[in-house]
C-alpha cells in the first residue's frame, strides 16, 4: 500500500496473506467460513510450493493470539483467468478446514448486485504489499482510502487505454495506491466487498494509472457454484 | 461488435444551427469517453473535443468552444454535437470516435455543408 | 498547441517498395506518465480513419506486420516494409499526450 498507514490492528477480521512457503505473497479476503477469495496470477509461479493461507494477522510476524495458518484443500482459479491479461482474476481458496471465527477472524459480506460503484466513493483497500517504490514490505497491515474512478476516465488513452471491461472497476492512484503484494486483497466499499486487487505488474502511485480491482458482483455466479 | 452511426448531417445556411447525433452500439456506452473529429474536404483531421458520458465532462479545442457544444443520452447510447453560427469553413464530414482503445472505432461520418 | 509535421506530403511509389513517412513535433509528447501517445491512422477515400500503431510501435490487432512504428521524443517514423496494392491511402501521425490532442497535415501515398 502506498501512502497509507498502518492498520488498526485487527480491525479487518476478514483480511488474509495468502502465503507461498512460508513468505506473504499475496492478500485474500475471507468470504466463508472455508474459502478465500485472491487473486488468480498470484499463484501461477507457486508450481511446486507450499500455499497456505494466514488468518486473524496484523504483524506477519509477531506472535498473535488470534493468527492462524491454514493448509490449502483446493485452489479454484477462474476457468477464463489467463497470465498475459487482466480479465477474469479471481481465484477461491478452500481451507483444510473451517476457520475458527471470532472478533479478529469473520467473512466479509461481498457485493451481490451488479451495479457501479458511484465514481469518487471512498473505498478501504488494505494489504502487506510494499508501501515505497523502493520495495520495502511492510511487517503490520496497512490501508488507504482511495475514490472510485469512473470506467470512462480509467479506459482513457492516456491511463488504461481501454482495458477496462465491465467486470473491473477502477481507483485513483495519485501517490495513494495498492502495489505490488496487495493483489488478490480486497476494496471495501462501505462495509461491503465490492473488488479484489488485481495481480498485473501495473506501475503503482501514477495518478494516469489507476488501481484496477476485479468486481466480484460480476463474479456472483461463479463464486456461488464454487462455494455450492 | 461496435458501431457509430453518425446523422444529422446536411445543407445549413450560414449563422444558422445543426445538431449532429452519434448512436453507439455493441458496448457499454458510459465505459468510454466520446470524441468528435471534423475533416473539410481535401484537408486533414481535425479534434473538436471530447466528453465523458459518466460525469458529462467536456473538454474542447480552443477554436470550437463557443460555437460547439457536446451532449448525451446515455438511455439512448448516443452522444450530440451541437453547432451554432455556422460559418462556410464548417463545412466538413463529421466523425464521432471512441477512445479506447486509442480512436480504434470511428463512425462513418456525416457531411455538413453550410451555404447560402 | 502541439504541431505535427509529417513529411512528404504526397509520395509515388510502386508495390513492393519500401516506404517511409516521418512525423516531428514541435515539441515532446513524452506523456507525464512516461509514454508516449503517438499513433498512426490510414485513410482511404470517404472512408473513418483506421487505427494502425499505437503508442509509437505498437501495430493494433488486425494490422500486417508489414506496418511497423518508430521513434522518441519529437521525431517518429512510420514504415511500410513492401508496400501493397491496399495501402495507397492517406496515413496521419497523432498526438494524444497532450490537450489539445493533434494530427499530422497527411501524407498520401499514391501509385507510380
Known amino acids: 500500500i502506498l501512502g497509507g498507514r498502518e492498520a488498526e490492528a485487527h480491525a479487518r477480521p476478514y483480511m488474509a496473506s495468502v502465503q507461498l512457503n512460508g513468505a506473504h505473497l499475496c492478500g485474500g479476503v475471507l468470504v466463508a467460513e472455508q474459502w478465500v477469495l485472491s487473486a488468480a496470477h498470484c499463484l501461477e509461479d507457486a508450481a511446486d510450493g507450499k500455499v497456505q493461507v494466514l488468518l486473524g494477522a496484523h504483524s506477519l510476524s509477531q506472535p498473535e493470539p488470534s493468527k492462524r495458518l491454514y493448509d490449502v484443500l483446493r485452489a479454484v482459479p477462474h476457468p477464463d483467468s489467463q497470465p498475459d491479461t487482466i480479465d477474469h482474476d479471481l481465484l477461491l481458496l478452500q481451507l483444510s478446514e473451517k476457520a475458527t471465527l471470532g472478533p479478529a477472524v469473520r467473512p466479509l459480506p461481498w457485493q451481490r448486485v451488479d451495479r457501479d460503484v458511484a465514481p469518487g466513493t471512498l473505498c478501504d483497500v488494505a494489504g502487506w504489499g510494499i508501501v515505497n517504490h523502493a520495495g520495502r514490505r511492510p511487517d503490520s497491515l496497512q490501508h488507504v482510502l482511495l475514490p472510485v474512478l469512473d470506467r470512462a476516465t480509467c479506459n482513457r488513452r492516456t491511463h488504461h487505454d481501454g482495458a477496462i471491461t465491465e467486470r473491473l472497476m477502477c481507483a485513483e492512484s495519485n501517490r495513494r495506491d495498492s502495489c505490488k503484494g496487495d493483489s488478490g486483497g480486497p476494496l471495501v466499499c462501505g462495509g461491503v466487498l465490492e473488488g479484489v486487487v488485481t495481480s498485473g505488474s501495473r506501475v503503482c502511485g501514477n495518478r494516469k494509472k489507476p488501481g484496477i480491482y476485479t468486481r466480484v458482483a460480476s463474479y456472483a455466479a461463479w463464486i456461488d457454484s464454487v462455494l455450492a | 461488435e461496435v458501431q457509430l452511426v453518425e446523422s444529422g448531417g446536411g445543407l445549413v445556411q450560414p449563422g444558422g444551427s445543426l445538431r449532429l447525433s452519434c448512436a453507439a452500439s455493441g458496448y457499454h456506452f458510459t465505459s468510454y469517453y466520446m470524441n468528435w473529429v471534423r475533416q473539410a474536404p481535401g484537408k486533414g483531421l481535425e479534434w473538436i473535443g471530447d466528453i465523458n458520458p459518466v460525469t458529462g465532462d467536456t473538454d474542447y479545442n480552443a477554436d470550437f468552444k463557443r460555437r460547439f457544444t457536446f451532449s448525451l443520452d446515455t438511455s439512448k447510447s448516443t452522444a450530440y454535437l451541437q453547432m451554432n453560427s455556422l460559418r462556410a469553413e464548417d463545412t466538413a464530414v463529421y466523425y464521432c470516435t471512441r477512445e479506447g482503445p486509442s480512436f480504434a472505432y470511428w463512425g462513418q461520418g456525416t457531411l455538413v455543408t453550410v451555404s447560402s | 498547441d502541439i504541431q505535427l509535421t509529417q513529411s512528404p506530403s504526397s509520395l509515388s511509389a510502386s508495390v513492393g517498395d519500401r516506404v517511409t513517412i516521418t512525423c516531428r513535433s514541435s515539441?515532446?509528447?513524452?506523456?507525464?506518465?512516461?509514454?508516449?501517445?503517438l499513433e498512426w491512422y490510414q485513410q482511404k477515400p470517404g472512408k473513418a480513419p483506421n487505427l494502425l500503431i499505437y503508442?509509437?510501435?505498437n501495430r493494433f490487432s488486425g494490422v500486417p506486420s508489414r506496418f511497423s512504428g518508430s521513434g522518441s521524443g519529437t521525431d517518429f517514423t512510420l514504415t511500410i516494409s513492401s508496400l501493397q496494392p491496399e495501402d495507397f491511402a492517406t496515413y496521419y501521425c497523432f498526438q494524444g499526450s497532450h490537450v489539445p490532442v493533434t494530427f499530422g497535415q497527411g501524407t498520401k501515398v499514391e501509385i507510380k
Open positions: 503508442k509509437v510501435s
Open positions: 515539441q515532446t509528447i513524452v506523456h507525464s506518465n512516461g509514454d508516449t501517445y
